[in-house]
């Protein structure tokens, strides 16, 4: 039998290499039986995770999952750092990993570096 | 049940390339991280690196950076790993591993593919 | 890297006796949710290697609960209360929370 559990499927470690200036949606894919959860995403500074209030965001709906989605428009250099989504589910809250944004500042970059550099070598990126 | 296949046994001459395989049966590649260990002979593990198939972003140990490139084809399943200028130093055991990205469900490792290097 | 160290290199043990293995790691496994990834790892003879403990203490399924994972910070242990025939092989402790992943250097459990 299935779990009616609230899952949030968000990779531990997992990551985003994008671009200062590009619109960027960051997406916290949830599980929910019945009722959906209210979802809130926060940002990790240290080991204190900020809400981000006032931020465009919006839900999505798939077949077996809904996505909760925080909206970049666009990307800044000070979006650089690790998110993470909760959800309320019955008097609980359900924290999901963190997922990084490695923000590159294409003002200060001689050229865009290609995806597979990127994806290889996320140290060298805008931090 | 999540399972892996891996391609089977290569000798290959020293400064060659080989591109080794690794298919997946009971999971999506997608939902996990598919990563490969190196073991000599006789030897201890070796962190390769690993890729999210879901993006194919990839992380390598340094030491492994310009001899190993993993990569993932979701439409097969698979994940590759190609190993360059191979040497005798690369005769070796590699296996390929897949871990559940969300919740450490489960973490299950192919039966290895051993390459030797050889003239 | 994060230098995981094992001890013993080997262990003799006879049939229905307990057994200990440590692991060290040269600094915290604690990733940013709080939780240290130290998995444990047997490769029994002419086998590929199996998960056996992840989370330090959680076991996975299939295996006895004669295993037991136990620690924190930087000091693991694996212990057997009462080893069976089927326990023959080498084990490895490897963390899972920094990159480059690494590896204890394997303790061999032999029976006496």
């Known amino acids: 039998k299935e779990s009616c559990d609230v899952q949030l499927y968000i990779k531990r470690q997992s990551y985003h290499s994008i671009f200062a200036g590009d619109p960027f949606k960051l997406e916290c894919p949830v599980k929910y039986c019945a009722h959906r959860p209210q979802v809130t995403w926060c940002k990790l500074n240290g080991t204190t995770c900020v809400k981000l209030e006032g931020r465009h965001t919006s839900w999505k709906q798939e077949k077996n999952l809904s996505f909760f989605i925080l909206h970049f428009e666009p990307v800044l250099p000070s979006d650089n750092g690790s998110y993470r989504c909760s959800a309320n589910f019955l008097s609980a809250i359900i924290e999901s990993h963190s997922t990084t944004l490695y923000v590159t500042d294409v003002k200060s970059a001689s050229e865009r570096p290609s995806k597979d550099e990127m994806a290889s070598r996320p140290w060298l990126l805008y931090s | 049940e999540v399972q892996l296949q891996q391609s089977g046994a290569e000798l290959v001459k020293p400064g060659a390339s080989v591109k080794l395989s690794c298919t997946a049966s009971g999971v999506n590649i997608k939902d996990t991280y598919m990563y490969w260990v190196k073991q000599r002979p006789e030897q201890g593990l070796e962190w390769i690196g690993r890729?999210?198939?879901?993006?194919?972003?990839?992380r390598y140990d340094p030491k492994f950076q310009d001899k190993a490139t993993v990569t993932a084809d979701t439409s097969s399943n698979t994940a590759h790993l190609q190993l360059s200028s191979l040497t005798s130093e690369d005769t070796a055991v590699y296996y390929c591993?897949?871990?559940?990205?969300?919740?450490?469900?489960?973490?299950?490792w192919g039966a290895g593919t051993t390459v030797t290097v050889s003239s | 890297d994060v230098v995981m160290t094992q001890a013993p290199l080997t262990l003799s043990v006879t049939i229905g006796q307990p057994a200990s293995i440590s692991c060290k790691s040269s600094q915290s496994l604690l990733d940013s949710d709080g939780k240290p990834y130290l998995n444990w790892l047997l490769q029994r003879p002419g086998q590929s290697p199996k998960r056996l403990i992840y989370?330090?203490?959680k076991l996975d399924s299939g295996v006895p609960d004669r295993f037991t994972g136990s620690g924190s910070g930087t000091d693991f242990t694996l212990k057997i209360s009462r080893v069976e025939a089927e326990d023959l092989g080498v084990y490895y402790c490897?963390?899972?929370?920094?990159?480059?992943?690494?590896f204890g250097g394997g303790t061999k459990l032999e029976i006496k």
């Open positions: 591993a897949v871990n559940d990205g969300y919740f450490e469900y489960f973490d299950v």
């Open positions: 989370l330090v203490s």
């Open positions: 490897w963390q899972d929370t920094h990159f480059p992943r690494t």
């Open positions: 890729i999210d198939p879901a993006n194919g972003y990839t």
